[in-house]
């Protein structure tokens, strides 16, 4: 922590300017008035302070705004944003997308994923929902950042906004996030024709239930293996060999390559070996012919 000293008269600061780069940390602490700093935050990012000097300026702002910085300050943080922790950002109320853009630009190339995720969360809370403008900003300035939002926050996305989401924006989304987004996408694209619908819905299929995957198998979609591998395990296990063959079309041969990986491995274990043999791929591990399959889960549910 910076020691408290009194400011020498010749070092008194009346405006935030480049002369401050010659100040030692204790001089900055003693001589820079926090209210002046806040009022002239727009100047700070043009001044080549050292990382250590920025620590002092952050400390000043923290003392002035213990409940969190106002947006007028946040908007002009610039490189000072790199000093912020998720705990700092959690105190903020951000509504402006210009603020979000400015800080996303600064964070580029730095390990700031936790801070960026918290910032986006604060923007969604501040704006009341994840509207189209916010999604557009995220896809333009922070591809993949959509997936940093919690399922609860993603639930505020109106289906009408889903069309603005690109496949690469969903690359890092987990199953719980896709569970939330998939029904919205299904609703958003429901009036499209078969092939056009599949192209649009494909990035969201990691959240699709079995019945929807079964329905796709009847539509000659020729699902690629990468998409198949992202389907929920629970959605894949009930599919028959015939349904998987129809779903994948010419891509069915890829099952051999993915034989040892979930969900393919788990699906193979649930199929009769003679059904698997009809694919002619040499898939092994199915239920041997003549074995009876008892589904004990059904019996437990009845008792």
């Amino acid at each position: 922590d910076v020691e408290r000293t009194t400011c020498p008269p010749e070092k008194e600061v009346h405006e935030i300017d480049e002369s401050l780069i010659f100040y030692k940390k204790r001089e900055l602490e003693a001589c820079v008035d926090a209210a002046l700093l806040a009022a002239q935050m727009d100047r700070v990012d043009a001044i080549p302070f050292t990382y250590e000097q920025l620590d002092v300026l952050k400390h000043k702002l923290d003392e002035l705004y213990p409940q969190g910085y106002p947006e007028s300050v946040i908007r002009h943080l610039g490189h000072l944003f790199l000093k912020m922790s998720p705990e700092d950002i959690r105190k903020w109320n951000v509504t402006s997308l210009e603020t979000l853009k400015a800080l996303l630009k600064v964070s580029k190339g730095h390990e700031m994923s936790a801070q960026v995720a918290t910032l986006i969360d604060r923007v969604v809370v501040g704006r009341g929902q994840l509207d189209k403008d916010t999604v557009d900003t995220l896809t333009a300035f922070c591809p993949g950042c959509l997936c940093s939002l919690s399922p609860e926050r993603l639930s505020s996305v109106p289906p009408s906004v889903i069309g603005a989401v690109r496949p690469q924006d969903l690359d890092t989304c987990g199953p719980r996030q896709l569970d939330v987004l998939y029904p919205k996408a299904r609703l958003a694209f429901q009036n499209m024709s078969g092939s056009e619908y599949f192209v649009k819905i494909r990035p969201f299929l990691g959240g699709a239930p079995t019945e929807d995957v079964k329905a796709l198998s009847q539509q000659n979609v020729s699902m690629d293996l990468a998409t198949f591998m992202k389907l929920r395990r629970e959605a894949v296990l009930p599919l028959t060999v015939a349904e998987v063959q129809k779903l994948l079309g010419p891509h069915v041969e890829g099952l051999k390559v993915e034989e040892q990986h979930s969900p393919v491995r788990d699906w193979i274990l649930k199929q009769r070996q003679d059904d698997l043999d009809t694919l002619g791929l040499g898939l092994q591990g199915g239920i041997p012919n003549g074995y009876l399959i008892l589904d004990l889960s059904v019996r437990e549910a009845l008792s």
Partner: nanobody, 116 residues
Framework: QVQLVESGGGLVQAGGSLRLSCTAS????????MGWYRQEAPGKERELVA????????NYADSVKGRFTISRDNAKNTVYLQMNSLKSEDTGVYYC?????????WGQGTQVTVSS
Amino acid sequence: QVQLVESGGGLVQAGGSLRLSCTASESGFSANYMGWYRQEAPGKERELVATINRFGSTNYADSVKGRFTISRDNAKNTVYLQMNSLKSEDTGVYYCRIMRPGNWYWGQGTQVTVSS
């Protein structure tokens, strides 16, 4: 990321002189605003002693005014710090820095020791 290599440090008697050099790997060097910093001991704060902008305009810390001169040779991608009338309090590791907001990369520094 630009590489900066400082040199020219050494042991010198109080009242003596040294000339430090800092060479940058960046081709657009002439546009850079450069500074020399001094760190008295490991873990202590680096303090700015002199700056030179792309137009050759210079600024100095009060403690070195009249004794140190910063200059640059854009053809050689190099900035210099001529240090005269050295005092024991000038002892430390000297680093050059491209004075660019958000640039926190430093060279390895060059040690200057002034014995009284």
